[in-house]
């Protein structure tokens, strides 16, 4: 779970090992702050829980791509 050290900076210290279906994920944000020990992705789930994940993992990248496509407005 993400940890807010000095708000508003939120950092991840551990990543989930478990692969999670993109259908459980609602959105994500990248953590790139130099105040954090590592780069991370924080997924927000459909039930509003937050999960720290490793942006180097393929399933994480695939999930971000899927969520990006899901939020793009269709061209008319």
């Amino acid at each position: 779970q993400p940890d807010a050290i000095n708000a508003p900076v939120t950092c991840c210290y551990n990543f989930t090992n478990r692969k999670i279906s993109v259908q459980r994920l609602a959105s994500y944000r990248r953590i790139t702050s130099s105040k954090c020990p590592k780069e991370a992705v924080i997924f927000k789930t459909i039930v509003a829980k937050e999960i720290c994940a490793d942006p180097k993992q393929k399933w994480v990248q695939d999930s971000m791509d899927h969520l990006d496509k899901q939020t793009q407005t269709p061209k008319t």
Epitope: K19, S21, I46, I51
Partner: antibody, heavy 119, light 113 residues
Framework: QVQLVQSGAEVKKPGASVKVSCKVS????????MHWVRQAPGNGLEWMGG????????IYAQRFQGRVVMTEDPSTDTAYMELSSLRSEDTAVYYC????????????WGQGTLVTVSS | DIVMTQSPDSLAMSLGERATINCKSS????????????LVWYQQKPGQPPKLLIY???IRESGVPDRFSSSGSETDFTLTISSLQAEDVAVYYC?????????FGQGTKVEIK
């Protein structure tokens, strides 16, 4: 392809504990979210608990809280479910179950372990 | 907790007949942002673990015959076997996976008349 192989049937006396194992192959246990579901004779399916990546920890159904412990041994890719203070109503088939990408449903099941509680 | 209620508890049909099982959830299992219903159906035969039949409320698992179909949204779902076969004799369960604790319906036993 995930495969789950469970330990054999057990007979226990009321008040005792039982520990059921579930060996994973074809996948690394720590990549999966392993859960346990039980089924009493002639009854339906009842979720007992399991690892929930959304909480980052093992969660348990309220009715088993304090009586069940689910653990993992990553070195052997084996999950365990230990139920204590057994009573006759705990006589059931216990299943471990999971899926490759955690969604909340189960597409891989162990073969089941019958636990009989009898004096 | 989301309570799942199936009806009927059991049904007996002739071979080739259409069998319908209903599943009702105490609250919606639809996530509107992706328009997905977090509901699955399992089939369980005696002495075997449950087998996944349908997920996301309407998608058949690979290898499941097309006589099995499911429909519904939010709180009301239906599993249909269009032409009952002898090998379909089993207990069928719905399960919601919108939020924990993950909950199952009580099951519907399907028999041949």
């Amino acid at each position: 392809q995930v495969q789950l192989v469970q330990s054999g049937a057990e007979v226990k006396k009321p008040g005792a504990s039982v520990k059921v194992s579930c060996k994973v192959s074809g996948y690394t246990l720590t990549e999966l979210s392993m859960h346990w579901v039980r089924q009493a004779p002639g009854n339906g399916l009842e979720w007992m608990g399991g690892f929930d990546p959304e909480d980052g920890e093992t969660i348990y159904a309220q009715r088993f809280q304090g009586r069940v412990v689910m653990t993992e041994d990553p070195s052997t890719d084996t999950a365990y479910m230990e139920l204590s203070s057994l009573r006759s109503e705990d006589t059931a088939v216990y299943y471990c179950a999971t899926n490759e990408f955690w969604s909340g449903y189960f597409d891989y099941w162990g073969q089941g372990t019958l636990v009989t509680v009898s004096s | 907790d989301i309570v799942m209620t199936q009806s009927p508890d059991s049904l007996a049909m002739s071979l080739g007949e259409r069998a319908t099982i209903n599943c009702k959830s105490s609250q919606s299992v639809l996530y509107s942002s992706n328009n997905k219903n977090y509901l699955v159906w399992y089939q369980q035969k005696p002495g075997q673990p449950p087998k996944l039949l349908i997920y996301w409320a309407s998608i058949r698992e690979s290898g499941v015959p097309d006589r099995f179909s499911s429909s519904g949204s939010e709180t009301d779902f239906t599993l249909t076997i269009s032409s009952l076969q002898a090998e379909d004799v089993a207990v069928y369960y719905c399960q919601q996976y919108f939020s924990s604790p993950w909950t199952f319906g009580q099951g519907t036993k399907v028999e041949i008349k």
